[in-house]
Amino acid sequence: LSLEGSRTLTVCPGSVQPLSSQTLRASSSAGTDPQLLLYRVVRGPQLGRLFHAQQDSTGEALVNFTQAEVYAGNILYEHEMPTEPFWEAHDTLELQLSSPPARDVAATLAVAVSFEAACPQRPSHLWKNKGLWVPEGQRAKITMAALDASNLLASVPSPQRLEHDVLFQVTQFPSRGQLLVSEEPLHAGQPHFLQSQLAAGQLVYAHGGGGTQQDGFHFRAHLQGPAGATVAGPQTSEAFAITVRDVNERPPQPQASVPLRITRGSRAPISRAQLSVVDPDSAPGEIEYEVQRAPHNGFLSLVGGGPGPVTHFTQADVDSGRLAFVANGSSVAGVFQLSMSDGASPPLPMSLAVDILPSAIEVQLQAPLEVPQALGRSSLSQQQLRVVSDREEPEAAYRLIQGPKYGHLLVGGRPASAFSQLQIDQGEVVFAFTNFSSSHDHFRVLALARGVNASAVVNITVRALLHVWAGGPWPQGATLRLDPTILDAGELANRTGSVPHFRLLEGPRHGRVVRVPRARTEPGGSQLVEQFTQQDLEDGRLGLEVGRPEGRAPSPTGDSLTLELWAQGVPPAVASLDFATEPYNAARPYSVALLSVPEATRMEAGKPESSTPTGEPGPMASSPVPAVAKGGFLGFLEANMFS
C-alpha cells in the first residue's frame, strides 16, 4: 500500500470541507479497487468533526471510510467555531490505511483552519462583520456583535496582546449617514477608530434620513503595536454593510431561482442562487421558509440540526451555508414547494428545483473507427462515441486528452481538440491520417455530460482496399499461383497512382509463399517470399505452397496469411487471406491455377520426371481446369513449356 496526496487540508473557519484525492490518495501495487482501501480513524479531530455526507447528523463520530468515498467527496471535515477568537488553528487526524493482505499504513492528516484563506462561505476575514440594521433617520451603535477584529489580536502571543490594538482606517465613508466615535464625527482628516473603542461601545452610525437605500463604509484593519506603532501581522480590507430599515414594512420579494444540480446519493449546500429574497426591512434571520411539499429525490437538512429532514429554516441558514439538500438514490428531478414570510407580511409561495445529475456516465464504444485505406480518413459516429448514464446524453461534450499519434481529429475540416456529440452525430468530426506509417492508431477523450466526466479510448484501424479470394478449398501438397484472382490491390493502385506492395506478417501455418522462377533458364528453385508487389501478382511470379498439417492423417483444415498492404500517400492496412485446405483430390476441379500437385499423385501417374528441381510445374494435374483458371494456368504452361 502507498499513500499519496498532500495530507494537508485547509479549511475555512466554521465551514465544511470534503477530503479529496489531492488530500488523501491511497493506492496498492495490486491495483486494488478503491472501495477495498479502508481507512480507520485512530484519533479524530479536536477542533471539529469528521462525518459522512449521507449520515452527517447522527452525532456519532466517523470510524471507518474508504478511498472510494474520498473520491466521491463524501467524507467531510466540519470545523466547529470556538467561543474564543483565533487567527489560525491546527488540527490533526490520525488514520490507519488497510487492505489485506498488505501491511497497514499509518497516516496523519494535518488540518489548517485559517482566516487568512479566501473563503467563499465567509467573505470576511474578521471574527465578525455582520453589518448593521438601522431605522430610517435614526442612529445605532456598532457593537462587537456586528464588527469584531479580535481574531487579528489573537495572532499576537497572549502576553503581548494587551499592548496591542486593531486600527480601523475608513477608506470610504458612509454616503447616507455619519460615523461617530465618542460623539465626534469621523472624516478624511480623522478616519480612524480602534477595536478598543468598538469594545467600549463608542462607535455609532447616524442615518441622515431621506430614504432607505443601502449604506456602508469600507475600511482597512491592521494590528497596532505599543504607542500606536504599526506592526507586521494579519490585515484585511473589507466593507461594513448598513441596512436602513423602513419604518413602513414592505413585503419580501422572492428572487429568480437557479435549480440545484446534484449527483444522486450525495449532499450539496443550498445557496442564495437557489433561495433568496429582497427585503430591505427584514434581517436574514427574520425571513422564514416552510416546506409545504417535498420531492421524492431527497430532503433538506441543517448542519448541526437533527438527522432527519427539516421543514423550517431561515434565510440566514441559507446565507451561512448551513442548509443542505441530501439526495437519495433517485435519479428523478424534483421540486420543493415552499412558503416564505418575514413575519409581518402574508406568506408567499416559492419553489426550489432539484436536478439530479448522474453519479457516473459511461462512454459507449461499440466499434473501432474503420478508416478506408484509399481515403485515409473517416467520420466518427455514435458507433465510436456515445455517452449514456441513467439516460442517453445527447448534450455530451468531448475533449481530447491524448491525441492520435499518426493523424489528427478535424471538425469542419480544421484540427480540433474539442467537439460535441451533436457534431459527431452530424458527421462533422473526422479522423485523418497525416503520417502513413501505421495501420492503426488510438486517441483518448474526456467526455463531459451534466457535470460528470468519464474517459474512453477510441481505437482506429485501416480497412484494406484489397479484393481477397473467397472460394472453395485448396489442395494440400500443391503449389498454387498467387495472382489477382486471389489477392488484388488493383483498385488501390489506381486510386493512389502507385504500385501497392505487400508484407507478409504471419502465416501460413502449413506452407509458404514462394517466388516462382519465370523460366527453366532462371537459376535456383522457389525462393521464400516475405514481400511482394501488386506487379508480382499480375506477373504470376508468386506461388503458395499449401502444406499438410503435421503429425496426423490428411484431413481438411483452415489456414491463413496475414499481410500488410502499403501504397503511396495512404496508411498501410492489415488484411488476411483465409482459406481452407484438403487432401489433394485429382478428380476435383480446383478453381485456382495449380503450379504443381503433390509428389505422390505424379508418381501414381507414372511420370516421376515431371517433378523438376526448378519448381516448374509438371504436367497438368488430372483435375480439369475450370475456365476461370484456364487462361492463367494454360497461359503459364504455354509460356514456359518450350523455354
Epitope: L375, G376, R377, R399, L400, I401, Q402, G403, K405, H408, L409, L410, G412, G413, R414, P415, A416, S417, A418, A432, F433, T434, N435, F436, T496, G497, Q568, G569
Partner: antibody
Framework: QVQLQESGPGLVKPSQTLSLTCTVS?????????WNWIRQHPGKGLEWIGY???????NYNPSLKSRVTISRDTSKNQFSLKLSSVTAADTAVYYC?????WGQGTLVTVSS | DIQMTQSPSSLSASVGDRVTITCRAS??????LNWYQQKPGKAPKLLIY???SLHSGVPSRFSGSGSGTDYTLTISSLQPEDFATYYC?????????FGQGTKVEIK
C-alpha cells in the same frame, strides 16, 4: 481571438543555439490543436519547422529534425523553439502560429 | 514530402479584375488545403481553410475550390488592399508544406 507573440534574441552566433519563445493570449495552449513554428528566409517562401500539440506531442520537419526541439510551459501559456548548430542559412523571420492566427514574426540573424 | 507548386509565380492585375491562382500537390491531399495572404513585412493571414471554407473576417470576394491534387484561389473583384503574396499550404500529410507563393501586383 488568439494572439501570439514571439520573443528572443535577434542575433545568434554561428554554431550556437537559436532560442525563441511564443506567448499565447486569448486561448490556452492545452486546447488549440497545433502550435507551430514556421520560418521565412529573406525574400523567400514559408518553411514549416515543427509543432507541439495541446497534449505535448511533437512533430518536426525531417530536414531540420536533428537540430530542432519544441517545448511548452503550460503555466505561462508559452511554447518555445530551440534550433541548434545554426549557420547563416538559418537567418530568417521566425513565426509562431496555430495556422488560424500568426505572431508578427521576429527576424533572427546568424552572424559572428 | 508533398510538393506544392503554385502558378503563376507572379501576376499583374487591375482593381476590379477576377484573379485565379492555382496550387498543385504532388499527390492527393484530400481537400486539406489552406490559403494565406502575406503583405510585405507582415505575417501571413489565413484566408481559406479546408479548400473552400472562408476564415472569419475574410471578405466574400475570396473563394477556394478544388479536389485531389488541383486547387484554386479566386478573387472575384480585386481590391487595392488585395495586392500581396498568396501561399497555399497542405495539412494532409506530414511534414506540412507550402507553395512557393504567387505575387499579385498592380498592373
Amino acid at each position: 481571438q488568439v494572439q501570439l507573440q514571439e520573443s528572443g534574441p535577434g542575433l545568434v552566433k554561428p554554431s550556437q543555439t537559436l532560442s525563441l519563445t511564443c506567448t499565447v493570449s486569448g486561448g490556452s495552449i492545452t486546447s488549440g490543436y497545433y502550435w507551430n513554428w514556421i520560418r521565412q528566409h529573406p525574400g523567400k517562401g514559408l518553411e514549416w519547422i515543427g509543432y507541439i500539440t495541446y497534449d505535448g506531442s511533437n512533430n518536426y520537419n525531417p530536414s531540420l529534425k536533428s537540430r530542432v526541439t519544441i517545448s511548452r510551459d503550460t503555466s505561462k501559456n508559452q511554447f518555445s523553439l530551440k534550433l541548434s548548430s545554426v549557420t547563416a542559412a538559418d537567418t530568417a523571420v521566425y513565426y509562431c502560429a496555430d495556422f488560424d492566427y500568426w505572431g508578427q514574426g521576429t527576424l533572427v540573424t546568424v552572424s559572428s | 514530402d508533398i510538393q506544392m507548386t503554385q502558378s503563376p509565380s507572379s501576376l499583374s492585375a487591375s482593381v476590379g479584375d477576377r484573379v485565379t491562382i492555382t496550387c498543385r500537390a504532388s499527390q492527393g491531399i484530400r481537400n486539406y488545403l489552406n490559403w494565406y495572404q502575406q503583405k510585405p513585412g507582415k505575417a501571413p493571414k489565413l484566408l481559406i481553410y479546408y479548400t473552400s471554407s472562408l476564415h472569419s473576417g475574410v471578405p466574400s470576394r475570396f473563394s477556394g475550390s478544388g479536389s485531389g491534387t488541383d486547387y484554386t484561389l479566386t478573387i472575384s473583384s480585386l481590391q487595392p488592399e488585395d495586392f500581396a503574396t498568396y501561399y497555399c499550404q497542405q495539412y494532409s500529410a506530414l511534414p506540412w508544406t507550402f507553395g512557393q507563393g504567387t505575387k499579385v501586383e498592380i498592373k
